[in-house]
């Protein structure tokens, strides 16, 4: 059985998806899609997070121990690469 991703009335086969993981345009809210060796990465626009940038970021999540290293994080709000 093929997995099919429905987007804009278009069905995308598993083969197509593996050839171009960004074909289904999975990144929401203006996130940019980049091919990755194990699939794809959504680089989220500022204010969004999640594997597909589907979540709005809410404050206070950064309070953690130990502090995370700085730098761009896929699936998190960031400047476009």
């Amino acid at each position: 059985d093929h997995h099919h991703h429905h987007h804009e009335q278009k069905l995308i086969s598993e083969e197509d998806l593996r050839a171009d993981p960004c074909a289904a345009r999975p990144c929401a809210h203006g996130g940019r899609c980049y091919a990755h060796f194990s699939g794809l990465v959504c680089a989220c626009a500022p204010g969004y997070m999640g594997a597909r940038c589907e979540f709005p970021v809410h404050p206070d999540g950064a309070s953690a121990l130990p502090a995370a290293p700085p730098g761009l994080r896929p699936g998190d709000p960031q400047r476009y690469l």
Epitope: H3, H4, L40, M49, P74, G75
Partner: antibody, heavy 124, light 107 residues
Framework: QVQLVQSGAEVKKPGASVKVSCKAS????????VHWVRQAPGQGLEWMVI????????SYAQKFLGRVTMTRDTSTNTVYMELKSLRSEDTAVYYC?????????????????WGQGTTVTVSS | DIQMTQSPSAMSASVGDRVTITCRAS??????LVWFQQKPGKAPKRLIY???SLYSGVPSRFSGSGSGTEFTLTISSLQPEDFATYYC?????????FGQGTKLEIK
């Protein structure tokens, strides 16, 4: 194997706070999102919050904004969910669940591995 | 928020029966639809992701189908261990939402 182990049951008074922990093992902790979902007695499942254990960013369901705080400790691979100003309707089983990989997805699984649940009882 | 409506909310069936549970989304959710099984006192257990893909270890009597806003979970031949409550989950958009559940009881 991939596992999420949660802290034990809690009994709290109205107005108090509760902090529930979820310790991950069997995978790279910072590579997957973690969700919290709750279930009141005899009721359905309710999504609460997601955290990126690597960056610490969070997103809350609207009804929990300001009352739930998520933290994580990357040295012990543990996520914490604190719920403040408890009321009787917060009596529920609280589950953590592993979400999507932060990087590298062909397909999306929603939530694939769940903790055993933590019962929180709010009673005066 | 996207509302997920499951039907029926409860049903009784016998071992060997074919059972279908439906989940309707209030708007299109692409293929971001997951099914879970939950037994009393236990955490939900994953069954199906991406509408129709079985997680490894899930018996082939379980299947999923649908697209857009209407989705179904089918159990082709009920086994005693299948009596449980079933939930759908949309993970297309924030906030994630579950169906209210379908309790499958022994007739």
């Amino acid at each position: 194997q991939v596992q999420l182990v949660q802290s034990g049951a809690e009994v709290k008074k109205p107005g108090a706070s509760v902090k529930v922990s979820c310790k991950a093992s069997g995978y790279t902790f910072t590579s997957y999102y973690v969700h919290w979902v709750r279930q009141a007695p005899g009721q359905g499942l309710e999504w609460m919050v997601i955290i990126n254990p690597g960056g610490g960013t969070t997103s809350y369901a609207q009804k929990f904004l300001g009352r739930v705080t998520m933290t994580r400790d990357t040295s012990t691979n543990t996520v914490y969910m604190e719920l403040k100003s408890l009321r009787s309707e917060d009596t529920a089983v609280y589950y953590c669940a592993r979400g999507e990989a932060v990087t590298g997805n062909y397909f999306y699984y929603g939530m694939d591995v769940w903790g055993q649940g933590t019962t929180v009882t709010v009673s005066s | 928020d996207i509302q997920m409506t499951q039907s029926p909310s409860a049903m009784s069936a016998s071992v060997g029966d074919r059972v279908t549970i439906t989940c309707r989304a209030s708007q299109g959710i692409s293929n971001y639809l997951v099914w879970f099984q939950q037994k009393p006192g236990k955490a939900p257990k994953r069954l199906i992701y991406a509408v129709s893909s079985l997680y490894s270890g899930v018996p082939s009597r379980f299947s999923g189908s649908g697209s857009g806003t209407e989705f179904t979970l089918t159990i082709s031949s009920l086994q005693p261990e299948d009596f449980a409550t079933y939930y759908c989950l949309q993970h297309d958009s924030y906030p994630y939402t579950f169906g209210q559940g379908t309790k499958l009881e022994i007739k």
